[in-house]
Interface confidence: low
């Protein structure tokens, strides 16, 4: 029988005696064959950390602060549950730690040097450690003690809780640097007077504090956001600028064998029978003998956190370096104005092979990190283990949701001008062999598919999309008898299709070789029914000008294109006989790389790009024999985006609908964690 | 139990300083909470002049801040008031208390108050 | 910020309810945690001030429940629901919501 108790780490004596009557509790609700509480207590935090790294505890509630150790090495544990504050209908489980101005002071981030800064308290998250940690490698040497730096860096301060006898400046704008709301100046709403009192140039609070201090619309408009990439924005606009975004009180347990879900039941229950209103005997945000007892006495209730969520991601890149700098100190050698090396990310062994080549070429501007999968090259992109990839436009929808920003945008049109203007983009068609005349749109039902992969546009989200329109659920692999759609669970009759071996099956990355656009035709060719690709696929690998056995006799007079219309046409005509539009593959990076990789990749098309008139010697960028490596090979060039700078701005809202509605859909298990931080 | 105890002077004359001492039992002042002056004058008005906090910063009424200082000895646990110029109108019974924090920022423990005359 | 208290004295017999105000000149309530930041004081003749009730409606530890405190944002109330000889004291509120702090003038409860 499996064992279904959680062990639930206690700090302190009324924590213990409020954890007891939590056990008891549940037990009087909840059959004897459901999850059921023990108690253990410990001296911290920190002990309670490594009690459940060592498998004497299972779980306990962290500040973020709390979470970032106990995701380090050795006790790596992850979040699994979090706390939720406001209703449940708009359920909130972070906070935006922002930099507040004034509308005319004309400054940006990293401008702050000599400016006077008004903190809520020393040490506290949003009002301290994030800004100072942020800034920390601007800090001018030696560094340590910090308050020091801090006092040295901007020309006055009031942070509150500071020691105003050895770091008076610290004090400067309100004496004596008093640590309760007796100093006017301490907490959220203190730093905002500060500001607002023109004592300070920048306060460092939540997004919150300015609505709860200023009620009046015109009020804010007198203020402004400083956002990382030295911008501003309108105070509104915090999920777009912020410092950090933080968790506010989270459930964690071990990464391996961490009870995850019998947690999620645990806690799930415990707030049906004992939650906010719920029981007069026993309430599990409140806390009679105490404050914040095992959860916060402001919670409303728990939100399971998506499993594909580790530490880092769940608190954020912003926030781990803010606070990965403030724990280790570590700046590079003197700070200067050049870019450091790009880190791309290869999907798995084919694409690995032509970034090494390139890393070569390009003489230690580009470096390369490899991953299995496109959403684990994002994840990485994320956390900063890589920079930038190359994407189809499904997976910009994915990555914009996870915080980064289209930078270039793949040509694949001969012009003048390639660089200076980013096509309207390419055609998504459903491709059919023509001898399977009886085949249209409207009868597709138990026929054999064949798809890029699941995520991406031409070979998901469009058609997908537009089935959903039609049939009203998502059980896609029970409408096309058998497919190959690489991304779909192992088991479905849409990785039936598909031809990798073993473990590589259906695996979306190159090792299946019916993955791509290239793999979908492939795929129809030798096995199905429809593939779904772009409107180039066909032409590009027929004619002979594919080399590869399976292509090199084909002919592109013996396919054609569903029309929407449930007529068929040759594949020439897909400007009139196209499912939808798509946008170009786009390059994404990080807001903070965001310069630095437009500037190296511009760089690096000259030296790489079509201009290079023979690849058999040299290197070129945009080759792979077809095989779509790192970039699509019938990019012409990299080209700006001028204003369509945002991931919604660069897919256009027809797309963005569209894959909006598909979400119900959706198995991408990095969409859920990202929408989980970004609803 | 938290017991905070008043010393000083019962006359002093106008144009000098004032020192008094709170000598704090059965807590350190070095371990947590702020440690405030209040004082109240004959009429019973009560007014809050300044505290010390725990990490030794210190905020002060701004009525008061150009002639008024707390400082501490947290080898003896005690902390002090000093209040220069003194005129009649700081005739007053002083106390030293202590903000709870919890409850946060009111005084939960206070001394018993040392009446102090400014006459010459 | 100013606090004004009424009456300023009043006399009653054991066993009577009794009310006491204060009123501040500006909102004493943080809209962030949603708390009243005022709490209310009892000073018997030759004493220090004793708190009783902290955000304008918690007591504090020992306190008997006879004492009340209500109110929220300018106007605030302590209630005696009944009166015993040993309340005889005079009774402060005090605003910790802004800097710096500041106590109203009292009102001396006097028995009959």
């Known amino acids: 029988v499996p064992d279904k108790t959680v062990r639930w780490c206690a700090v302190s004596e009324h924590e213990a005696t409020k954890c007891q009557s939590f056990r008891d509790h549940m037990k009087s609700v909840i059959p004897s064959d459901g999850p059921s509480v023990a108690c253990v207590k410990k001296a911290s935090y920190l002990d309670c950390i490594r009690a459940i790294a060592a498998n004497e505890a299972d779980a306990v509630t962290l500040d973020a602060g709390l979470v970032y150790d106990a995701y380090l090495a050795p006790n790596n544990l992850k979040p699994v549950v979090a706390e939720f504050y406001g209703s449940k209908e708009d359920p909130q489980t972070f906070y935006y730690a922002v930099a507040v101005v004034k509308k005319d002071s004309g400054f940006q981030m990293n401008q702050l040097r000599g400016k006077k800064s008004c903190h809520t308290g020393l040490g506290r998250s949003a009002g301290w450690n994030i800004p100072i940690g942020l800034l920390y490698c601007d800090l001018p040497e030696p560094r340590k003690p910090l308050e020091k730096a801090v006092a040295n860096f901007f020309s006055g301060s009031c942070a509150p809780c500071a020691d105003g006898t050895d770091f008076p400046q610290l004090c400067q704008l309100c004496p004596g640097c008093g640590c309760s709301t007796l100093n006017q100046y301490f907490g959220y709403s203190g730093a905002f007077k500060c500001l607002k009192d023109g004592a300070g140039d920048v306060a460092f609070v939540k997004h919150s504090t300015i609505f709860e201090n200023l009620a009046n619309k015109a009020d804010r408009d007198q203020y402004e956001l400083l956002c990382l990439d030295n911008t501003r924005k309108p105070v509104d606009e915090y999920k777009d600028c912020h410092l950090a975004q933080v968790p506010s009180h989270t459930v964690v347990a071990r990464s391996m064998g961490g009870k995850e879900d019998l947690i999620w039941e645990l806690l799930n229950q415990a707030q049906e029978h004992f939650g906010k209103d719920k029981s007069k005997e026993f309430q599990l945000f409140s806390s009679p003998h105490g404050k914040d007892l095992l959860f916060k006495d402001s919670a409303h209730g728990f939100l399971k956190v998506p499993p594909r969520m580790d530490a880092k991601m769940y608190l954020g890149y912003e926030y781990v370096t803010a606070i990965r700098n403030l724990r280790e100190g570590t700046c590079p050698e003197a700070p200067t104005d050049e870019c450091k090396p790009v880190k791309w990310c290869a999907l798995s062994h084919h694409e690995r092979l032509k970034c090494d080549e390139w890393s070569v070429n390009s003489v230690g501007k580009i470096e390369c990190v490899s991953a299995e999968t496109t959403e684990d090259c994002i994840a990485k992109i994320m956390n900063g283990e890589a920079d930038a990839m190359s994407l189809d436009g499904g997976f910009v929808y994915i990555a914009g949701k996870c915080g980064l920003v289209p930078v270039l945008a793949e040509n694949y049109n001969k012009s003048d001008n390639c660089e200076d203007t980013p096509e309207a983009g390419y055609f998504a068609i459903a491709v059919v062999k023509k001898s399977a005349s009886d085949l249209t749109w409207d009868n597709l039902k138990g026929k054999k598919s064949c798809h890029t992969a699941v995520g991406r546009t031409a070979g998901w989200n469009i058609p997908m999309g537009l089935l959903y329109n039609k049939i009203n659920h998502c059980r896609f692999d029970e409408f096309f008898s058998e497919g190959c759609a690489p991304g779909s669970k192992k088991d479905s009759s849409l990785c039936k299709l598909c031809m990798g071996s073993g473990l590589n099956l259906c695996e979306p990355n190159n090792k299946e070789g019916y993955y791509g656009y290239t793999g979908a035709f492939r795929c129809l060719v030798e096995k199905g029914d429809v593939a779904f690709v772009k409107h180039q696929t066909v032409p590009q690998n027929t004619g002979g000008k594919n080399p590869d056995p399976w292509a090199k006799n084909l002919n592109e007079k013996d396919y054609e294109l569903l029309c929407l219309d449930g007529t068929r046409k040759p594949v020439e005509e897909y400007a009139n006989c196209h499912l939808a539009r798509a946008p170009n593959h786009a390059v994404v990076t990080r807001k903070d790389k965001e310069a630095c990789v437009h500037k190296i990749l511009r760089q690096q098309q000259h030296l790489f790009g079509s201009n290079v008139t023979d690849c058999s010697g040299n290197f070129c960028l945009f080759r792979s024999e077809t095989k779509d490596l790192l970039f699509r090979d019938d990019t012409v060039c990299l080209a700006k985006l001028h204003d369509r700078n945002t991931y919604e701005k660069y897919l256009g809202e027809e797309y963005v609908k569209a894959v909006g509605n598909l979400r119900k859909c959706s198995t991408s298990s990095l969409l859920e964690a990202c929408t989980f931080r970004r609803p | 139990e938290v017991q905070l105890q008043e010393s000083g002077p019962d006359l002093v004359k106008p144009s000098q300083s004032l020192s008094l001492t709170c000598t704090v039992t059965g807590y350190s002042i070095t371990s947590g909470y702020s440690w405030h002056w209040i004082r109240q004058f004959p009429e019973n008005k009560l007014e809050w002049l300044g505290y010390i906090h725990s990490s030794g910063a210190t905020n002060y009424s701004p009525s008061l801040k150009s002639r008024f200082s707390i400082t501490r000895d947290t080898s003896k646990n005690q902390f002090f008031l000093q209040l220069n110029s003194v005129t009649t109108e700081d005739t007053a019974t002083y106390y030293c208390?202590?903000?709870?924090?919890?409850?946060?920022?009111?005084?939960?423990?206070w001394g018993q108050g040392t009446t102090v005359t400014v006459s010459s | 910020i100013e606090l004004t208290q009424s009456p300023s004295s009043l006399a009653v017999s054991v066993g009577e309810k009794v009310t006491m105000t204060c009123k501040s000149s500006q909102s004493l309530l943080y809209s962030t945690n949603q708390k009243n930041y005022l709490a209310w004081y009892q000073q018997k003749p030759g004493q220090s001030p004793k708190l009783l009730i902290y955000?304008?409606?918690t007591r504090e530890s020992g306190v008997p429940d006879r004492f009340t405190g209500s109110g929220s944002g300018t106007d605030f109330t302590l209630t005696i629901s009944s009166v015993k000889a040993e309340d005889l004291s005079v009774y402060y509120c005090q605003q910790y919501y802004s800097y710096p702090p500041t106590f109203g003038s009292g009102t001396k409860l006097e028995i009959k």
């Open positions: 208390a202590r903000d709870g924090y919890s409850p946060p920022y009111a005084m939960d423990y």
């Open positions: 955000w304008a409606s």
